[in-house]
């Protein structure tokens, strides 16, 4: 349960991540598991350890082996092993099993591949991809961020696909590969214009001062699995967590799928202990996808408590 | 939003043992320590000890050592304390609270009080 | 183990301006890893305790960024730059640095 199968490429930066996790860590310490013997936190070395991190730059055959990583706290060490292997580089373009990462299915909706492993690195954009060894053009292929988008994917596009970026290490650069498979799968789905079902545009939303309040953004955004879709509330035209309010925060509800099929994504505002500028502000239930962006805004107003008394007396 | 549900307010004999239990929901509780802290008047707040509720192991303050015993259940997402040989001294609010990726006690339960009586 | 030690009660503070409260450690806090293991708590009447600093400065989630905090290695103060009402309860300073963890006695807030 607490040991990892890790591998490489010889003359490649490796980089792993103790199995074990802190609940929190104070520190962690690695060992080659075979010595016993404690692998050096300074960087000068070409193996060396780094918090949860083990570096191998670059890693060499040699370097095979377990290694044991202790996650210290004042409560509890907690023990991990990371299983490396590193293999020699192919001299031909296919990339063996024992290479590949896990398989990742898309369809003509939604075609990401990420880069296995890298947010354990420190890269730069762009990523190179390829596939079968072929350097992928033409304007189908777009590289974002840490994965691969490929446009009106098509069954022929199954295959193998390996990205390949640069780690940087103290001004030194390290290449890394990863491979892993793509298969298409046939979806009917498909993607429209965001549809807001609720706020409804220019709603008054009545409430209580000093109470708490909710605001539900709800939108639909097509059949089947979607590619980007997203539903955001906005405060005067900024973002939420840049507004700076702590009583007001919005939290995702459930990604919704109708038995009509229908996608829907819900976010909802919540307002804590509701203040009189707070009715001041203009509430913009966003809601965007591929097709573009809907707005929906809501105003507050006051709700008067009934009076007791005027009903009694 | 993280919550710990603890048991309601015990009344108990002196000798006597008894299990405080707190709820955990709206995170998995394997991935957390679970602390548990006591609260009087007099001594104000105690460290009693810490359960890894993935593996069982615990770790307790010596004054608690024999006193108290942590365990936790991972299917019912639910970790107890059993507190035994109970004495007028052991009268207390007691909180269960859990750590977080970066440090301890990080949300806290609402509290049992404890009262041992003849 | 390691003490903790707080003023009982700190002066009274009037609405709207800033308040202090020490906290100090007989051991240092600062652990080998660079990171200094003291927290503040407030426990409001009536409710359980709350985090609002860990590893001496930072700010917990969701606590408003009137609270600060700094130290050394064993002495430690909490500032509150605009008290409000709901400010007032009960403030613990705690050392997460070694078992068994250990707490201040608690600092009362109190408003004019």
């Known amino acids: 349960k607490f040991s990892k199968q890790s591998w490489g490429l010889e003359n490649e930066a490796l980089i792993v991540r103790c199995p074990r996790q802190g609940k929190p860590s104070y520190t962690v310490d690695w060992y080659y598991s075979q010595t016993n013997k404690s692998i050096p936190t300074q960087e000068r070395n070409r193996v060396f350890a780094s918090g949860q991190l083990l570096k191998f730059l670059p890693a060499a055959v040699a370097d095979s082996g377990i290694y044991t990583c202790i996650v210290r706290s004042p409560t509890f060490n907690r023990t991990g092993y990371a299983n490396v292997t590193i293999y020699k580089k192919q001299s031909d373009c296919n990339v063996p099993d024992y290479l590949m990462y896990s398989t990742v299915s898309g369809s003509e909706k939604n075609s990401k591949i990420y880069c296995p492993t890298i947010d354990l690195y420190n890269w730069t954009a762009p990523l190179e991809w390829f596939k079968n060894c072929q350097a992928l053009q033409g304007s189908r292929y777009r590289a974002h961020k840490s994965f691969l988008v490929i446009d009106n994917v098509m069954t022929e596009d199954a295959g193998d696909y390996t990205c390949k970026f640069i780690h940087n290490e103290n001004g030194a650069n390290y290449s890394v590969t990863a491979t892993r498979s793509f298969t298409v799968k046939d979806e009917q789905g498909f993607s429209l214009f965001p549809v807001i079902g609720a706020p409804a545009q220019n709603e008054i939303k009545e409430v209580e001062i000093g109470k708490n309040a909710n605001l539900t953004c709800s939108a639909c955004f097509g059949k089947g699995t979607q590619f980007l879709a997203a539903v955001l509330w906005q405060l005067n035209g900024t973002k939420i967590t840049d507004f700076g309010e702590p009583r007001i925060q919005q939290e995702e509800g459930q990604n919704q799928s109708f038995s009509n099929g229908l996608a829907c994504l819900d976010m909802v505002l919540r307002i804590a202990d509701v203040k009189e500028e707070d009715l001041l502000l203009q509430y913009d239930c966003l809601a965007l996808n591929l097709h573009g962006l809907r707005r929906h805004t809501v105003r507050l107003s006051r709700k008067n408590p009934i009076d007791h008394h005027s009903i009694y007396c | 939003q993280v919550q710990l549900q603890q048991s309601g307010a015990e009344v108990v004999r002196p000798g006597a043992s008894v299990t405080l239990s707190c709820k955990a929901s709206?995170?998995?509780?394997?991935?957390?320590?679970m602390h548990w802290v006591k609260q009087t008047p007099v001594h104000g707040l105690e460290w009693i000890g810490a359960?890894?509720?993935?593996?069982?192991?615990?770790a307790y303050s010596q004054n608690f050592k024999g006193k108290a015993t942590l365990t936790a259940d991972e299917s019912s997402s639910t970790a107890y304390m059993e507190l035994s040989s109970l004495t007028s001294e052991d009268s207390a609010v007691y909180y269960c609270s859990r750590s977080a990726t970066d440090y301890y006690f990080a949300s806290w339960g609402q509290g049992t009080t404890l009262t041992v009586s003849s | 183990d390691i003490v903790m030690t707080q003023a009982a009660i700190s002066n009274p503070v009037t609405l709207g301006t800033s308040a202090s409260m020490s906290c100090r450690s007989s051991k240092s806090l600062l652990h080998s890893n660079g990171i200094t293991y003291l927290y503040w708590y407030l426990q409001k009447p009536g409710h359980s305790p709350q985090l609002l600093i860990y590893q001496m400065s930072n700010l917990a989630s969701g606590v408003p960024d009137r609270f600060s905090s700094s130290g050394s290695g064993t002495d430690f103060t909490l500032k509150i730059s605009r008290v409000e009402a709901e400010d007032v309860g009960v403030y613990y300073c705690?050392?997460?640095?070694?078992?068994?963890?250990?707490f201040g006695s608690g600092t009362k807030l109190e408003i004019k």
């Open positions: 705690a050392q997460n640095l070694e078992l068994p963890f250990t």
């Open positions: 359960i890894d509720p993935e593996t069982g192991d615990t």
């Open positions: 709206d995170y998995t509780i394997t991935d957390y320590e």
